[in-house]
Interface confidence: low
């Protein structure tokens, strides 16, 4: 019977310089089990070598020399009883791209060099990059566990050393980011923000690096209301806005949060199901009316939180003045004045530019105000006839501003009538 | 009072396709989106994909995708769901729904019975 | 996706009793839960949103629990008519994902 050694290996291998890669490979060689049972030492040489005094890159045989460049990183890995010769290379360099053989022995019978099955090593540049793991989606707020790792690496060869860099890291002590883990209680303000972690063999040139964007789940925190670009100042959950009315308005609610929160706007204080009078973060007013006030409610909802913010609108108008107009009645000249404005404006009589106020002592004037609904009316009486021609004036004011009117009254009574006295405002 | 109220029940031929209608009321059709939800007889429910009616934007779930078109008639506060290539696997009650955003989907449709056999 | 787990397909209780249904979320959902019932022929009734919070005219023998992955729906003071079929969905992330479902008997 022909003596059968055969070995199967594959031809050629690759592998990124600093990782590892496991090379499968079985062997047979005759033996007979009557034989006496010397030990079976398998050995892997570099190509060329010679195997009598050469020293070998990874065998069983603790008797022999292994090249102080592959010691510990290229090793046997299965039983070789098995005839099991599968070879582990870690943290592979540049200089151990080549061709290696495979030889068996044991006792005197069995000395064997499988050189027709060559493994062919090749190292190439390290483009690999590290993972960052972590689970999905981070919260803010919520610890999180991340680990950075090596595809293809493994624990032969010097320790790898780690870095994590980025803005969510600031607060952590420098040794914290030097393992290759780290745990992160992410802020609203990491979201978007870069994570890097750098992966170094010792002693070593190689290094390479993986940046992740953070994407940090967080409900809004603040909503903010701007008008016209400015936002408005809010007091415990309540933002106060006066507004004219008639005046357009474009509110913009905003609440930062990730994902963005929905944003609607309601009338009023709203009760949970109640339907928004809009659907986005704008609200707009073509014509304020002073039915309007009592405002609004924005309300950011999210799948974390929800949050509100009134909108406390009080309505304001300018004063709007109807008269004076004048007319003579049977106690004397009677004048009124009706006038509307929110807030209520303080009204002010005058002749011939001077004020009348309060009832006059002499009884010569009276003044009389009154209000119904959004409007207030003003009259004043003036006893007895007029010496000349007079001017009558009736002025309102509140705040937002003022609006006068006044009337010429032309001297005797005949020109009057008993109609409305003509104006000249 | 928030209405949907579905189209009738479908016989259909495999490989025919149906469209099944929604039409909303009592509320404003472009403020929240409409999900469709498919429930095979005797068995749970499934998001098929939802419809954005302000812009007219869907979005399939990935396992539905290529077997709904999802569409919307604003004048008329209607959803539509186009379902083509039918086969027995799409037998089943669809429902229309509308998403609320922090409170869920509180409104639904009375369902529309598609039964596919030859 | 996330996938919603009702482990429990049946339950089977007496009138007056407290029954809980469970549900489990293989990632965290925050408070993103819904609870629906479901009777034969019927289109799906809302119960709970936001985990906890009952919709209007929903009973107060129904509560709703739980943040994160674990939710609960507790029915108390079990009715007759309480005999349907019970959903939890989540509505964290798309595609909004349902429970398989818990039937509820009445003995």
């Known amino acids: 019977e022909k003596p059968v050694y055969e070995l199967q290996v594959q031809k050629s291998v690759t592998v990124q310089e600093g990782l590892c890669v496991l090379v499968p490979c079985s062997f047979s060689y005759p033996w007979r089990s009557w034989y006496s049972s010397p030990p079976l030492y398998v050995y892997w040489f570099r190509d060329g070598e010679i195997p009598y005094y050469a020293e070998v890159v990874a065998t069983n045989n603790p008797d022999r020399r292994v090249k102080p460049e592959t010691q510990g990183r290229f090793r046997l890995l299965g039983d070789v009883q098995k005839k099991n010769c599968s070879l582990s290379i870690g943290d592979a360099r540049m200089e151990d791209t080549g061709s290696y053989f495979f030889r068996v022995e044991r006792g005197r019978d069995v000395k064997y060099s499988y050189q027709q099955n060559k493994l062919n090593l090749e190292v190439t540049a390290l483009i690999e990059k590290p993972d960052i793991h972590f689970l999905e989606p981070l919260e803010s707020g919520r610890p999180t566990r991340l680990s950075c790792s090596l595809p293809g690496s493994c624990e032969a060869g010097p320790p790898l050393t780690f870095s994590w860099t980025g803005n969510a890291l600031s607060p952590l002590d420098p040794e914290t980011t030097r393992s290759s883990e780290l745990t992160l209680t992410p802020r609203p303000e990491d979201h978007g923000t870069n994570l890097t972690c750098q992966m170094k063999r010792q002693g070593a040139q190689v290094t390479t690096e993986r940046t992740v964007q953070l994407n940090v789940s967080y409900a809004p925190q603040t909503i903010t209301i701007f008008r016209n670009g400015i936002a408005l100042e809010i007091l415990q959950n309540t933002s106060y806005l006066p507004v004219l009315e008639g005046q357009a308005l474009r509110l913009l609610c905003d609440a930062p949060s990730n994902p963005p929160a929905h944003l609607s706007w309601f009338q009023g204080s709203p009760a949970l199901n109640a339907t928004p009078i809009s659907n986005t973060g704008i609200l707009e007013l073509r014509r304020v009316r002073s039915a309007e006030e009592g405002g609004f409610t924005c309300r950011a909802q999210h799948p974390l939180g929800f949050l509100q913010i009134f909108l406390n609108l009080s309505v304001y108008s300018l004063p709007q003045l109807l008269g004076p107009s004048c007319s003579w009645e049977a106690e004397g000249l009677h004048c009124r004045c009706s006038f509307r404005a929110r807030p209520a404006p303080s009204l002010c009589w005058r002749l011939e530019e001077k004020p009348l106020e309060g009832n006059s002592s002499q009884g010569s004037f009276k003044v009389n105000s009154s209000s119904a609904g959004p409007w207030a009316n003003s009259s004043l009486i003036l006893h007895g006839g007029l010496s000349s021609d007079l001017k009558v004036s009736c002025k309102a004011w509140n705040i937002y501003g003022s609006q006068s009117g006044s009337v010429l009254l032309l001297q005797g009574r005949s020109n009057l009538g008993t109609g409305v006295v003509p104006a000249a405002l | 009072e928030i209405q949907l109220q579905q189209s009738g029940p479908e016989l259909v031929k495999p490989g025919a396709s149906v469209k099944v209608s929604c039409k909303a009321s009592g509320y404003s059709f472009t403020d929240y989106n409409m999900y469709w939800v498919k429930q095979s007889h005797g068995k749970s429910l499934e998001c098929f994909g939802y419809?954005?009616?302000?812009?007219?934007?869907?979005y399939y779930n990935q396992k539905f995708k290529g077997k709904a078109t999802l569409t919307v008639d604003k004048s008329s506060s209607t959803a539509f769901m186009h379902l083509n290539s039918l086969t027995s696997e799409d037998s089943a009650v669809y429902y229309c729904a509308f998403y609320y955003g922090y409170y869920g989907v509180p409104y639904w449709g009375q369902g529309t019975l598609v039964t596919v056999s030859a | 996706d996330i996938v919603m787990t009702q482990s429990q397909k049946f339950m089977s209780t007496s009138v007056g009793d407290r029954v809980s249904v469970t549900c489990k979320a293989s990632h965290n959902v925050g408070t993103s839960v819904a609870w629906y019932q479901q009777k034969p022929g019927q289109s799906p009734k809302s119960l709970i949103y936001?985990?906890?919070y009952r919709y209007s005219g929903v009973p107060d023998r129904f509560t709703g629990s739980g943040s994160g992955t674990d939710f609960t729906l507790t029915i108390s003071n079990v009715q007759s008519e309480d005999l349907a079929e019970y959903f939890c969905?989540?509505?964290?992330?798309?595609?909004?994902?349902f429970g398989s479902g818990t039937k509820l008997e009445i003995k």
């Open positions: 969905q989540q509505y964290n992330s798309y595609p909004l994902t």
């Open positions: 419809i954005d009616p302000y812009n007219g934007g869907p």
């Open positions: 936001s985990a906890s």
